[in-house]
């Protein structure tokens, strides 16, 4: 496994990219003046206690910003949050940190990111533009859970 985070560019099937706005990740159409975030992706070192065949458990961070994606409950509902955390601090832990972990599954060119802490909940964007990234259980038309990854550098 890689010991350095892999920088990637992520967009959904509607060619919307991830942008950081007021400490929230939103998906917006790719335009000249849009500055997409670069996502850092690194595999978890400890998979013994994680489910097998569900995907590659990874941490997702915002490149150079010391922010990582995590899942936590707000009331009864799991929510997607950005937390100040160094992705390498997560990688170097002696235990998996499930709240920051996602099962990365690839089918052809499409990738999905399922929360390890909340199985069945996926990173998604609303089919409408300019919406925050969310966690959803509904894999239908209202939300897009399929993303395309482009390796950078």
């Amino acid at each position: 496994k890689s010991e350095m985070p892999q920088p990637v560019s992520i967009q959904d099937i509607n060619h919307r990219v991830w942008v950081l706005q007021d400490q929230i990740l939103i998906a917006v159409p790719r335009k000249d003046r849009v500055s997409p975030v670069t996502i850092s992706l690194i595999s978890c070192r400890h998979v013994e206690t994680l489910e097998k065949d569900r995907g590659n458990p990874i941490y997702l961070g915002l490149n150079g910003l010391n922010l990582c994606l995590m899942c936590a409950k707000a009331g009864d509902q799991p929510t997607l949050q950005l937390k100040e955390k160094d992705i390498m601090d997560l990688y170097n832990q002696p235990e998996p940190v499930k709240s920051f972990l996602f099962y990365h599954s690839q089918s052809g060119r499409n990738s999905t990111f399922e929360s390890v802490a909340f199985p069945g909940w996926f990173i998604a964007v609303s089919s409408e533009g300019g919406c925050p990234l969310i966690l959803t259980q509904e894999l239908g038309k209202a939300n897009t859970t399929d993303f395309g990854l482009t390796m950078l550098f």
Epitope: T49, L90, P94, E95, P96, K98
Partner: antibody, heavy 121, light 111 residues
Framework: QLQLQESGPGLVKPSETLSLTCTVS??????????WGWIRQPPGKGLEWIGS???????YYNPSLKSRVTISVDTSKNQFSLKLSSVTAADTAVYYC?????????????WGQGTLVTVSS | QSVLTQPPSVSGAPGQRVTISCTGS?????????VHWYQQLPGTAPKLLIY???NRPSGVPDRFSGSKSGTSASLAITGLQAEDEADYYC???????????FGGGTKLTVL
């Protein structure tokens, strides 16, 4: 039945290095699933994790002790060792070695009997 | 001060039921990490009593049971016996501190 046995000096002078070895019998230290750890207990106090090692050499240390701790493994002797440098009276404790088994988080499922190390001049 | 908080002592008469609590935070028990329990009889090494919140290793009587909810866990002992007199420690992991953490220990006295 897996057994762990700590060995090493019972008395160490301040500023010197504490060295202990744990010998494992009844099982192989080279098992992929397990780490091997050191935990200490000052007299009359609670337990403190010092660090853990895998047979491959991967180590994890308690950040509060990291600058002074080295844990190593010798698979040929079925042993792992602890070195703690620049000791003070605060390092006086019973030192236990233990097997660290897969769980979430990992669990210390087999323990040695412990060895008391006193730091004194 | 321990990261996981336990009552310093509990007591009960033979045959009674006692519980020992273990309270953590959002970076350990509340982050989804399980809780393990150890029994330390006087003058001996700790022995694994409960792992993964509620599982007993073989040889541990079913008088001992564990549970977890939110940021805390508890150990229950029913049908208290004189030989249960010991120190009990909970253990988990804290991802903010990057350490395996133990409670401060609870001394159980059988009256």
């Amino acid at each position: 039945q897996l057994q762990l046995q700590e060995s090493g000096p019972g008395l160490v002078k301040p500023s010197e290095t504490l060295s202990l070895t744990c010998t494992v019998s009844g099982g192989s230290i080279g098992s992929r699933s397990y780490y091997w750890g050191w935990i200490r207990q000052p007299p009359g106090k609670g337990l403190e994790w010092i660090g853990s090692i895998h047979y491959s050499g991967t180590t994890y240390y308690n950040p509060s002790l990291k600058s002074r701790v080295t844990i190593s493994v010798d698979t040929s002797k079925n042993q792992f060792s602890l070195k703690l440098s620049s000791v003070t009276a605060a390092d006086t404790a019973v030192y236990y070695c233990a097997r660290v088994a897969p769980s979430y988080p990992r669990v210390f499922d087999y323990w040695g009997q412990g060895t008391l190390v006193t730091v004194s001049s | 001060q321990s990261v996981l908080t336990q009552p310093p002592s509990v007591s009960g008469a033979p045959g009674q039921r006692v519980t020992i609590s273990c309270t953590g935070s959002s970076s350990n028990i509340g982050a989804g990490y399980d809780v393990h329990w150890y029994q330390q009889l006087p003058g001996t090494a700790p022995k694994l009593l409960i792992y993964g919140n509620r599982n007993r290793p073989s040889g541990v009587p079913d008088r001992f049971s564990g549970s977890k909810s939110g940021t805390s866990a508890s150990l229950a002992i029913t049908g208290l016996q004189a030989e249960d007199e010991a120190d009990y420690y909970c253990q988990s992991y804290d991802y903010s501190l990057r350490v395996y953490v133990f409670g401060g220990g609870t001394k159980l006295t059988v009256l």
